[in-house]
Amino acid sequence: SLLPVPYTEAASLSTGSTVTIKGRPLACFLNEPYLQVDFHTEMKEESDIVFHFQVCFGRRVVMNSREYGAWKQQVESKNMPFQDGQEFELSISVLPDKYQVMVNGQSSYTFDHRIKPEAVKMVQVWRDISLTKFNVSYLKR
Amino acid sequence: SLLPVPYTEAASLSTGSTVTIKGRPLACFLNEPYLQVDFHTEMKEESDIVFHFQVCFGRRVVMNSREYGAWKQQVESKNMPFQDGQEFELSISVLPDKYQVMVNGQSSYTFDHRIKPEAVKMVQVWRDISLTKFNVSYLKR
């Protein structure tokens, strides 16, 4: 069954945590649907963003942070492991120094920590996708 | 009650026709939600687009056409009559020489015809909005 989109969930992250998302683009890649995953510092959607991950399917991925309301230096990748019309599984792992983004089991993107992952309080998944799975796994202490 | 998004409806347009859309952005303007309305030449979403109208709420509007699979010269406007968090009523009227876009009763954008409006067979409304009304009115002959 489908999860609502935008999908928002409270989350606490630290090294070892992984966020897993399963979904499907709502349009063909020719029409450039988007997927966005934002790690927020508060439960409010206007809050700062520790890690912003935006896919323009078929074109590019941009990653960034939003600090005190201002977007910082954007990181762009043309790597496009997503398949037109196909379901995807996205996992974002918190490594000691960066986020590692896997797409369908394949390491696809990294983003160096600018803000501590411990500052994350909420994850939002949204834009032009249907969502079937959202999970945050925590490293067993 | 809400209409599904993406929302797709068969439509025949000519001078005097008006497409009316009521909806609301799904996110605050800080997060740059989008609204897109596309007038397609076929019932298929991969088909050419006679009139492409995309709002990046709080930032800008772009208009274009997609002909034989290729995007043409983009027209951009910084005019932003949409209100953060507020419902909007959008009406697109087919004039003899152009499309006229009204936002909340105020003439806000125009786009000269590149392809005859009679080539339109389908209208799609999508991206980051909830949709409460979609109507195509035809001029009585």
């Epitope: 510092t41 942070s65 910082k72 160096d112 920590h113 600018r114 803000i115 501590k116 500052a119 | -």
Partner: antibody, heavy 124, light 107 residues
Framework: ELQLVESGGGLVQPGGSLRLSCAAS????????MSWVRQAPGKGLEWVSN????????GYADSVKGRFTISRDNAKNTLYLQMNSLKPEDMAVYYC?????????????????WGKGTLVTVSS | QAVLTQPSAVSVSLGQTARITCQGG??????ASWYQQKPGQAPVLVIY???ERPSGIPERFSGSSSGDTATLTISGAQAEDEADYYC??????????FGGGTHLTGL
């Protein structure tokens, strides 16, 4: 061996201008963000400005905004700081520094290599 | 005026543990870096991302942070560790700010 060598310092009158240069060698200069940090005589370190690897994005401390301009020439492996409307309080040793690992400035990783500095004296 | 507050001096005996604090930063959000500066020399990065050591920095240097305070710890301080130490964090990730500096003495 990685080296950063600053030059262009000297004596200038208040209201005057100076252009500092930092010649980089021993690493792929065009891949790293760079920064200018200054230290007034007997005082602590003060961040002045930074620039991303391509030169398209810059940042400035409030104390120098509108007066100083950072730039770089990746073909010449050189970082610059154009200083205008100099004030007595701008008098300091100016260091150029390389960010540890990213092409954009990221304070999380610090600055891992510094030049020896060049002294700017502002006096009438 | 430094936004990050450090003690102006910390005294430690040879072989003992020195702790230098840095207060006033948003260390719940931003990481701390630490620099060592000896007279007439350029600063040297000794800790970044709160607790990471660059290659070539002795293991006796360690770092931590909690709340509004970051701490540099030198376990078994050596004579060559006598120097000024500066903490650095971010007003934002791309905007560095330094503490006022701490002189480590007694060695």
């Amino acid at each position: 061996e990685l080296q950063l060598v600053e030059s262009g310092g000297g004596l200038v009158q208040p209201g005057g201008s100076l252009r500092l240069s930092c010649a980089a060698s021993g690493f792929t200069f065009s891949s790293y963000a760079m920064s200018w940090v200054r230290q007034a005589p007997g005082k602590g370190l003060e961040w002045v400005s930074n620039i991303n690897s391509g030169g398209g994005s810059t940042g400035y401390a409030d104390s120098v905004k509108g007066r100083f301009t950072i730039s770089r020439d990746n073909a010449k492996n050189t970082l610059y700081l154009q200083m205008n409307s100099l004030k007595p309080e701008d008098m300091a040793v100016y260091y150029c520094a390389k960010y540890l690992r990213t092409y954009y400035p990221n304070a999380a990783f610090g600055m891992d290599y510094w030049g020896k500095g060049t002294l700017v004296t502002v006096s009438s | 005026q430094a936004v990050l507050t450090q003690p102006s001096a910390v005294s430690v005996s040879l072989g003992q543990t020195a702790r230098i604090t840095c207060q006033g930063g948003n260390f719940g959000r931003y990481y701390a870096s630490w620099y060592q500066q000896k007279p007439g020399q350029a600063p040297v990065l000794v800790i970044y991302r709160d607790s990471e050591r660059p290659s070539g920095i002795p293991e006796r240097f360690s770092g931590s942070s909690s709340g509004d305070t970051a701490t540099l710890t030198i376990s078994g301080a050596q004579a060559e560790d006598e120097a000024d130490y500066y903490c650095q964090s971010g007003r934002s990730s791309d905007n560095a700010v330094f503490g006022g500096g701490t002189h480590l003495t007694g060695l």
